[in-house]
Amino acid sequence: EKLPKAPVITTPLETVDALVEEVATFMCAVESYPQPEISWTRNKILIKLFDTRYSIRENGQLLTILSVEDSDDGIYCCIANNGVGGAVESCGALQVKMKPKITRPPINVKIIEGLKAVLPCTTMGNPKPSVSWIKGDNALRENSRIAVLESGSLRIHNVQKEDAGQYRCVAKNSLGTAYSKLVKLEVEVFARILRAPESHNVTFGSFVTLRCTAIGIPVPTISWIENGNAVSSGSIQESVKDRVIDSRLQLFITKPGLYTCIATNKHGEKFSTAKAAATVSIAEWSKSQKDSQGYCAQYRGEVCDAVLAKDALVFFNTSYRDPEDAQELLIHTAWNELKAVSPLCRPAAEALLCNHLFQECSPGVVPTPMPICREYCLAVKELFCAKEWQAMEGKAHRGLYRSGMHLLPVPECSKLPSMHRDPTACTRLPYLDYKKENITTFPSITSSRPSADIPNLPASTSSFAVSPAYSMT
């Protein structure tokens, strides 16, 4: 018969290194008689036999942690007791080893140039991982602006455009390496004007192109302001290349102005703007105003819209208080007077009246109107509207039509320049050039002049007889 023997732990516990999710085993070999009861503690807390995370075998001498978690690290002790002598204890540490893990990866960042950017990269691992960063395909070098913090985050002071790109963090220890996903650092740049528009001193009615170039990220938009208001006329052409926007504003200069180029881009909810201004002055502007008795502008009325050349500059007479309205009212009144005339006369008379009241502008230091060519005036008077003209003159002689005649802005043909003397001195009426080709029957002309006096309009193929002897002076 064996003698009772107090427990002796023959293989003391050792420090165990274990990887997360792997198995870790502590062995506590005990010699004793009778057989001891063996219990296990972790950090002095009893491990319950029914805890499914553990397996206790060999009469309690083997403790197995079935799937190690990082929270399992600590001091494990086995305690053997068989009632003979005192209980014995042996302890060993579990060191949970962990491949690097990125617990807070970096995210895409938009940052304004000049500010500070921080890309997070929080890691776990045992041994503690070292963190480095890759930009594009290359390892990122630290410098006075760029540093990897103790936490693993990347800090960039005074962000520059060239800092933009794709970044990833790398966590490394003896057990392995972890990579974050690629993230994008976008550097936004406040709108800035690279090339301001230049001031111009030009002749009245010139074309001027104002050019404004701006840069920014995102690419800015450019708008133009004229004397504090949105530009009402002119054409804008834009092109974008390498984050640079080039805007060209082409203007018809009919008055001096201050033109401002405004470059704007958006950063989140905020906008950044940059401005540059240029003046457009008119050479001898005050003299022009005095001499010209008017100004040139595009026709914006309705009555003559279909008659006048599209987008043409016409002359507005400043002897009227509100020239554009006054001239439109005059033509409107004349239009009503024309309702009763023949279908042959009406369009010709409309062409004559519109071009007489809204005369084509000619270039030069001063805005100057170009009168209608005498030939076209006479064609309306003696060919297209012979009857009506006679009737009108007859009424005027009898005093029946004085107010009407005053309202009808009919030119006096004899006081108009001839296109045969100076073709650049007067305006032609294209309607009449076209229409006379299609006249096959003469209106009955009963004016005091013989019918041979109908003027010779430009095309020699006209279908009505004209006399080259007609004196066009």
């Epitope: 001499d291 270039p363 230091v365 001839s418 073709p423």
Partner: antibody
Framework: EVQLVESGGGLVQPGGSLSLSCVAS????????MNWVRQAPGKGLEWLSV???????YYADSVKGRFTISRDNVKNTLYLQLNNLKPEDTALYYC?????????WGQGTQVTVSS | EIVLTQSPSSVTASAGEKVTINCKSS??????????LAWYQQRPGQSPRLLIY???TRESGVPDRFSGSGSTTDFTLTISSFQPEDVAVYYC?????????FGSGTRLEIK
């Protein structure tokens, strides 16, 4: 037919003066812009001045302050007063009808500035 | 002022040959849908004669072998079939703004 006949040219000493005339016929003179253009011997054309139908005048920088254009619509005559003449003003002086193109030209009158 | 640069300064051509003369303006002469550029011919010992106005409109009486083209700053006078009577100096001129200015001229001679 349009006719422009210049006169008044001649030999003049530097610093001297001369008055050129151009009589127009064959058209209603008052309705048209009139110009003076000159051509130095063997050289190109040089525009000098224009006068519009309201008698408003414009000049080339080379003659501004020395030459004066004027018109008399009753006499159908265009004038050019030449003052403080210089040797480089020696040229054939043309009277020309035309607003923005120079449409009808006279035969010209010769001005020679020499000591 | 607007400077007009004419090229070439002289041309020699045979009868029936096509001749082109160029005129480049230092700034646009386009106003109100018209190009204010004219071409003139000056035969030896004669006054200049208007050939083309508004860049492409032929003056009455000018043979249709003469034509003008171009817009804004670049213009061309073309003689489609050179004739002996076309021997002359040709000038371009802008009527866009005063002072009106001429090109330096192109002398056209016969081979």
């Amino acid at each position: 037919e349009v006719q422009l006949v210049e006169s008044g040219g001649g030999l003049v000493q530097p610093g001297g003066s001369l008055s050129l005339s151009c009589v127009a016929s064959g058209f209603t003179f008052s309705l048209y812009y009139m110009n003076w253009v000159r051509q130095a011997p063997g050289k190109g054309l040089e525009w000098l001045s224009v006068i519009d139908t309201h008698s408003i005048a414009y000049y080339a920088d080379s003659v501004k302050g020395r030459f004066t254009i004027s018109r008399d619509n009753v006499k159908n005559t265009l004038y050019l007063q030449l003052n403080n003449l210089k040797p480089e003003d020696t040229a054939l002086y043309y009277c020309v009808l035309g607003r923005t193109a120079l449409v009808r030209w006279g035969q010209g009158t010769q001005v020679t500035v020499s000591s | 002022e607007i400077v007009l640069t004419q090229s070439p300064s002289s041309v020699t051509a045979s009868a029936g040959e096509k001749v082109t003369i160029n005129c480049k303006s230092s700034q646009s002469v386009l106003y109100n849908q018209k190009n204010y550029l004219a071409w003139y011919q000056q035969r030896p010992g004669q006054s200049p004669r208007l050939l083309i106005y508004w860049a492409s409109t032929r003056e009455s009486g000018v043979p249709d072998r003469f034509s003008g083209s171009g817009s804004t700053t670049d213009f061309t006078l073309t003689i489609s079939s050179f004739q002996p009577e076309d021997v002359a100096v040709y000038y371009c001129q802008q009527g866009y703004s005063v002072p009106y200015t001429f090109g330096s001229g192109t002398r056209l001679e016969i081979k």
